[in-house]
C-alpha cells in the first residue's frame, strides 16, 4: 500500500522537516526558518510558536518539532501549552485580584502558587498538635494524649493530613 501510495502521491516521500513544494514540481523542500513539519507528507510547514515577552523559550523550534514555552522567573505556567503566565507569590501567601496577600491565621501555603489551605485538624484523627502551624507550613500532628500514658511509646509517625480544618492552638 505504501509503495502504491508513493507512486500516486510523490508528496508521501517527503520526510518530517520538509514540505512538498507545489511550486517546484512537488519536490521535497526544507522547512523555511521559524517553521516545522513534525510528520512526513506535509504540503506546508507550520509556523513555530514564538515565546515572547513573559513567555520564555523552554525548547527551541527545530525543522521537525515546535518550540515550547514556559514563563520568565516570577511567573508560572497555566493553561494548555502554557497559554498563560500567572504571577508567583511567596510561601505563606496566595494570589488575589489585587496581588499577593498573606495567608489568614489558621491557613498555610507552602508553594509559590495556589491558595492558602486550612491547617490539618489533628483532633479529627484523635491526635494532638506536635508542631504549630504557620503561614508557610501545616501543623504537625503527634500522638494522642492517651498514647502518652506511662509505658507507651512517644515516637509515633505523624498521621497523614486528611480532612482540613482549624487546629486548636
Amino acid at each position: 500500500f505504501e509503495r502504491t501510495r508513493s507512486l500516486q502521491d510523490p508528496c508521501s516521500n517527503c520526510p518530517a522537516g520538509t514540505f512538498c513544494d507545489n511550486n517546484r514540481n512537488q519536490i521535497c523542500s526544507p522547512c523555511p526558518p521559524n517553521s516545522f513539519s513534525s510528520a512526513g507528507g506535509q504540503r506546508t510547514c507550520d509556523i513555530c510558536r514564538q515565546c515572547k515577552g513573559v513567555f520564555r523559550t523552554r525548547k527551541e523550534c527545530s525543522s521537525t518539532s515546535n518550540a515550547e514555552c514556559d514563563c520568565t522567573p516570577g511567573f508560572h505556567c497555566l493553561g494548555a501549552g502554557c497559554s498563560m503566565c500567572e504571577q508567583d507569590c511567596k510561601q505563606g501567601q496566595e494570589l488575589t485580584k489585587k496581588g499577593c496577600k498573606d495567608c489568614c491565621f489558621g491557613t498555610f501555603n507552602d508553594q509559590k502558587r495556589g491558595i492558602c489551605r486550612p491547617w490539618t485538624n489533628c483532633s479529627l484523627d484523635g491526635k494532638s498538635v506536635l508542631v504549630n502551624g504557620t503561614k508557610e507550613r501545616d501543623v504537625v500532628c503527634g500522638p494522642s494524649p492517651a498514647d502518652l500514658s506511662p509505658g507507651a511509646s512517644s515516637v509515633t509517625p505523624p498521621a497523614p493530613a486528611r480532612e482540613p480544618g482549624h487546629s486548636p492552638q
Epitope: 515577552g53 513573559v54 516570577g74 498563560m84 500567572e86 504571577q87 489585587k98 496581588g99
Partner: antibody, heavy 123, light 107 residues
Framework: EVQLVESGGGLVQPGGSLRLSCAAS??????????VAWIRQAPGKGLEWIGD???????YYNPSLKSRVTISRDNSKNTLYLQLNSLRAEDTAVYYC???????????????WGQGTLVTVSS | DIQLTQSPSSLSASVGDRVTITCRAS??????LNWYQQKPGKAPKLLIY???TLQSGVPSRFSGSGSGTDFTLTISSLQPEDFATYYC?????????FGQGTKVEIK
C-alpha cells in the same frame, strides 16, 4: 485603576512623521510581566497590531511596519511612545495603546485600552 | 503570518437568542486565542483570553471554546448591550493578528 490616555493625533502630510504618546496610570510600565502595545484601526476596518514593548525594554514589531516604526517609553513619566515615519494615506487610522495581560495573569491579550487618537494622513 | 477567518461576517439576532461566532486559524495555534467586543466609536473590550478564560467583570453569558484551528465564542442569551462587532486575536506567533470581525445586529 488602570488608565491609558493617547495623545498626538491629528492631520499629517503624506511622507511626514507622527509621534504619539500614551500616558499610563494605575500601574508601572516597568513592572515585571507588563507589556504595552500599539494597535490601530483604519476607518470601517479591523484591528492591526503595530508592536509592543515589555517591562524589560524588549520590543516586537509587525514586520509589515517594522522599517517605519519605533516604540519607546519613558519610565520616569510612565509614558509610551509610537514613532511612525514615511506616512501614507493607508496609515490613516485610530491608534490605540493597550496593556497586555489581565491583573495577575499575563499573556498577549489586551484587557486595558486607551480611548484612541485619530491620525489622518492627507495633503 | 497566521490568518484568522471569522464566520459569519455579520448576523442578525434577537434579544434572548443563543449566538455562536467561529474563528478558524490558518494552522494550529493551540489555545492562544482571545475574543474582544467593540462598539462604534469605542475601544475594544476583552471578553475571553486563552481560548476559554472569562475576563474579570465579563458576564457569564459569554463563553469561549476550542483549540487547534477552530474556536467558538458563544453568547448564551443575547442582551441589548451585546449588539456590537466581535474580533478574535491570536498570540501564537508574531505578528499578533486579528480576525476580520463579526457584526452582530438586531433582527
Amino acid at each position: 485603576e488602570v488608565q491609558l490616555v493617547e495623545s498626538g493625533g491629528g492631520l499629517v502630510q503624506p511622507g511626514g512623521s507622527l509621534r504619539l504618546s500614551c500616558a499610563a496610570s494605575g500601574f508601572s510600565l516597568s513592572t515585571s510581566g507588563v507589556a504595552v502595545a500599539w494597535i490601530r484601526q483604519a476607518p470601517g476596518k479591523g484591528l492591526e497590531w503595530i508592536g509592543d514593548i515589555y517591562h524589560s525594554g524588549n520590543t516586537y514589531y509587525n514586520p509589515s511596519l517594522k522599517s517605519r516604526v519605533t516604540i519607546s517609553r519613558d519610565n520616569s513619566k510612565n509614558t509610551l511612545y509610537l514613532q511612525l515615519n514615511s506616512l501614507r494615506a493607508e496609515d490613516t487610522a485610530v491608534y490605540y495603546c493597550a496593556r497586555g495581560g489581565s491583573d495577575t495573569v499575563v499573556g498577549d491579550w489586551f484587557a486595558y485600552w486607551g480611548q484612541g487618537t485619530l491620525v489622518t494622513v492627507s495633503s | 503570518d497566521i490568518q484568522l477567518t471569522q464566520s459569519p461576517s455579520s448576523l442578525s439576532a434577537s434579544v434572548g437568542d443563543r449566538v455562536t461566532i467561529t474563528c478558524r486559524a490558518s494552522q494550529s495555534i493551540s489555545s492562544y486565542l482571545n475574543w474582544y467586543q467593540q462598539k462604534p466609536g469605542k475601544a475594544p473590550k476583552l471578553l475571553i483570553y486563552a481560548a476559554s478564560t472569562l475576563q474579570s467583570g465579563v458576564p457569564s453569558r459569554f463563553s469561549g471554546s476550542g483549540s487547534g484551528t477552530d474556536f467558538t465564542l458563544t453568547i448564551s442569551s443575547l442582551q441589548p448591550e451585546d449588539f456590537a462587532t466581535y474580533y478574535c486575536q491570536q498570540y501564537y506567533s508574531t505578528p499578533l493578528t486579528f480576525g476580520q470581525g463579526t457584526k452582530v445586529e438586531i433582527k
